[in-house]
């Protein structure tokens, strides 16, 4: 079954994916997409590299590692519950059907906050200020109307929460690593 990674609402999520270039600077195109890896390419592409650079990205998605050395791990900034899902990392090795595909499961945990009493209200798009607590989506959002202006990183500055407290260094052994050449 797929490897599962976890993060909390408001944190940055980290999805590991690596390959070893055949030679320094001899890069292989990579795409990241939301949803399981299809037969070709990536569906719902959020980031793409070519043989030289990152040539496409969308807001909140970036590569934090040294992609020129094959670290194409994806960072998703300031996650919400809607970021939960399967992500596809595809190493696009030249040749027919040579691609390496990795499906990574990202589970976003609702932020646990217990400040002043809160009121559960029906969702409307007109909330002046919202903070997601335990809940699925729009319908289980709570307002913290009496709070001063704060941001989510002040509430939780914990490092990315990975399943079974995996150390980031161990991620290279999790299967999403390949050697080219």
């Amino acid at each position: 079954s797929e490897v599962e990674y976890r993060a909390e609402v408001g944190q940055n999520a980290y999805l590991p994916c690596f390959y070893t270039p055949a030679a320094p600077g001899n890069l292989v195109p990579v795409c990241w997409g939301k949803g399981a890896c299809p037969v070709f390419e990536c569906g719902n592409v959020v980031l793409r590299t070519d043989e030289r650079d990152v040539n496409y990205w969308t807001s909140r998605y970036w590569l934090n590692g040294d992609f020129r050395k094959g670290d194409v791990s994806l960072t998703i900034e300031n996650v919400t519950l809607a970021d939960s899902g399967i992500y596809c990392c595809r190493i696009q090795i030249p040749g027919i059907m040579n691609d390496e595909k990795f499906n990574l499961k990202l589970v976003i945990k609702p932020a646990k906050v217990t400040p002043a009493p809160t009121r559960q209200r029906d969702f409307t798009a007109a909330f002046p200020r919202m903070l997601t607590t335990r809940g699925h989506g729009p319908a289980e959002t709570q307002t913290l109307g009496s709070l001063p202006d704060i941001n989510l990183t002040q509430i939780s500055t914990l490092a990315n929460e990975l399943r079974d407290s995996r150390l980031a260094n161990d991620l290279r052994d999790s299967g999403a690593t390949i050697r080219i050449g």
Epitope: R6, G35, L81, S84, G85, K109, G135, A139
Partner: antibody
Framework: EVQLVESGGGLVQPGGSLRLSCAAS????????MHWVRQAPGKGLEWVGR????????KYAPKFQGKATISADTSKNTAYLQMNSLRAEDTAVYYC????????????WGQGTLVTVSS | DIVMTQSPLSLPVTPGEPASISCRAS??????VAWYLQKPGQSPQLLIY???NRYIGVPDRFSGSGSGTDFTLKISRVEAEDVGVYYC?????????FGQGTKVEIK
């Protein structure tokens, strides 16, 4: 591997009650929400409610409020559905469902257990 | 409650041909829609989440689209193993509701 195994179904008299169990393996139920969905014979799917086993917070569809009670025993990694005042219309296959992880789309389903309400 | 209305309710298909199922929500659900297939005698299985994202193991002949109130599930080339009842579901607000189901069968 994630597995959900329901048990406790069977024949119940109208007005009676029943407790269904859902034994989970391959994951810790405290790391997600556990839901119950039912399906009457030849009919569609109907969400009953869910529990957050980490803090026992529950949520129910309005029609099941007061009729259904969802609970969980994290030491047994098991979720439960108690149904009271059963009527013939409650005859259905009851599925224990794990969502993907705090989102209400359902990636893992049990095999279901049939509850028949009849005299 | 948000009502999810599917059409058609029955869809005879020819293997190798495309097929399409529509789902309409009674109010906007953004892209919070999932699609399931229930094969005869089996539990439902997840196909698509957040309207367009394929779940693991789902063949890419299945695709989902839509936002707001109108959603579509497409099968680019139907195979015999695709028969069963397809359900849409909104996961936007509780109670989470399903469409009535669309029965897909081979002509």
């Amino acid at each position: 591997e994630v597995q959900l195994v329901e048990s406790g179904g069977g024949l119940v008299q109208p007005g009676g009650s029943l407790r269904l169990s859902c034994a989970a393996s391959g994951f810790n139920i405290k790391t997600t929400y556990m839901h119950w969905v039912r399906q009457a014979p030849g009919k569609g799917l109907e969400w009953v409610g869910r529990i957050d086993p980490a803090d026992d917070n529950t949520k129910y569809a309005p029609k099941f409020q007061g009729k259904a009670t969802i609970s969980a025993d994290t030491s047994k990694n098991t979720a439960y559905l108690q149904m009271n005042s059963l009527r013939a219309e409650d005859t259905a296959v009851y599925y224990c469902v794990r969502d993907f992880g705090y989102v209400a789309w359902f990636a893992y389903w049990g095999q279901g257990t049939l509850v028949t309400v009849s005299s | 409650d948000i009502v999810m209305t599917q059409s058609p309710l029955s869809l005879p298909v020819t293997p190798g041909e495309p097929a399409s199922i529509s789902c309409r929500a009674s109010q906007s659900v953004d892209n919070y829609v999932a699609w399931y297939l229930q094969k005869p005698g089996q539990s439902p299985q997840l196909l698509i989440y957040y309207a367009s994202n394929r779940y693991i193991g789902v063949p890419d002949r299945f695709s989902g689209s839509g936002s707001g109130t109108d959603f579509t599930l497409k099968i680019s080339r139907v195979e015999a193993e695709d028969v069963g009842v397809y359900y849409c579901q909104q996961h936007y607000s509780s109670p989470y509701t399903f469409g009535q189901g669309t029965k897909v069968e081979i002509k």
